[in-house]
């Protein structure tokens, strides 16, 4: 299973649920669904309040039980380490795959943390991070921001991923804006 890591704003906008959590239990495999289940302890929710409604405590995260079908494997054994998890809701359950945005909270830049906490949501409605995978590539819409990190280095390590968000400048126009300049 291969997939290009998304820009964190794309991960935020395309996910039903974005939370901060600790992985606290060993994975279990359900013998009916053949999904692997990790026990988590949620510490913060950044997106998904409406989707979850009253059941706003997520205790498990689900993933396919094999690597070849994009199952997520949690490598850290540190149960006190917090992770940012962006996933999809299926039948009220949080699902993730290899392609989901799952990262140690401490590995995120301050700008990314600010993005997940409050800023990325501003760009979800109107703006689109548009990956530029090979030269030449051009904007297809004024609401697109060209994401060129992949051309230079690992996409999740790039400057645009770590420090910028694609946000509305005016109606019909989105531009890269520094998350440092956003009010914390």
């Amino acid at each position: 299973c291969t997939c290009v890591p998304p820009h964190p704003q794309t991960a935020f906008c395309n996910s039903d649920l974005v939370i901060r959590a600790k992985f606290v239990g060993t994975p279990e495999v359900n013998q009916t669904t053949l999904y692997q289940r990790y026990e988590i302890k949620m510490t913060k929710m950044y997106k998904g309040f409406q989707a979850l409604g009253d059941a706003a405590d997520i205790r498990f995260v689900y993933t396919p039980a094999m690597e070849s079908v994009c199952g997520y494997f949690h490598r850290s054994h540190n149960r006190s380490e917090e992770f940012l998890i962006a996933g999809k809701l299926q039948d009220g359950l949080l699902h993730i795959t290899t392609c989901s945005f799952v990262a140690p909270w401490n590995s995120l830049s301050l700008a990314q943390r600010r993005g997940f906490t409050k800023t990325y949501t501003v760009g979800c409605e109107e703006c689109t991070v548009f990956p530029c995978l090979s030269i030449p590539c051009k904007l297809q819409s004024g609401t697109h921001c060209l994401w060129t990190d992949q051309l230079l280095q690992g996409s999740e390590k790039g400057f645009q991923s770590r420090h910028l968000a694609c946000l509305p400048r005016e109606p019909g126009l989105c531009t890269w804006q520094s998350l440092r300049s956003q009010i914390a």
Partner: antibody, heavy 117, light 111 residues
Amino acid sequence: QVQLVESGGGLVQPGGSLRLSCAASGFTFSSYAMSWVRQAPGKGLEWVSAISGSGGSTYYADSVKGRFTISRDNSKNTLYLQMNSLRAEDTAVYYCARGGFFNMDYWGQGTLVTVSS
Amino acid sequence: DIALTQPASVSGSPGQSITISCTGTSSDVGGYNYVSWYQQHPGKAPKLMIYDVSNRPSGVSNRFSGSKSGNTASLTISGLQAEDEADYYCQSYDFTYGSVFGGGTKLTVLG
């Protein structure tokens, strides 16, 4: 009591196709993942494929991926294995078993698939 | 082929105890408590003897027991009987390969 009965085995030429069936009875079929496991003559057991209770998730061993397709019809309590592009090394007794990747608590009697020209 | 490592054969006299080992890695045996053991008599289908490392299905004699330490699982048969003569296979869940079996161990009951 739980019963699993395989059928559909036989002699087939290399490159040919075969469809195995497994009729299940004595339990709520849709509540269990099911697997196919094979055993080449004089050899050990090899897990081939598994499918979730609903049929929504399917898994394959690398040796059969892209050639075999597992499926199920819960209304008929039947498990299937469609085998295409068969090779000599696919020759084996094929068992259907109740369970996914482990803890296979009931097995059929097996059906022999021979791939030879 | 990816397989768990079992001794090809073990033997024992009636009444004795024998242990069959099953060695894997931290990705399979060592990583999950999902080890199963199967008994297979010649020409017959396998039969589940132990599940989830150490649990016995109903109907299986309490002479059969399972355990695990690190990356190695073990099946112990105490008070060996003639009808225990068979092939024994271990199996484990593996996140990469789905399910892996051991190569099998032929148990011979002497005398």
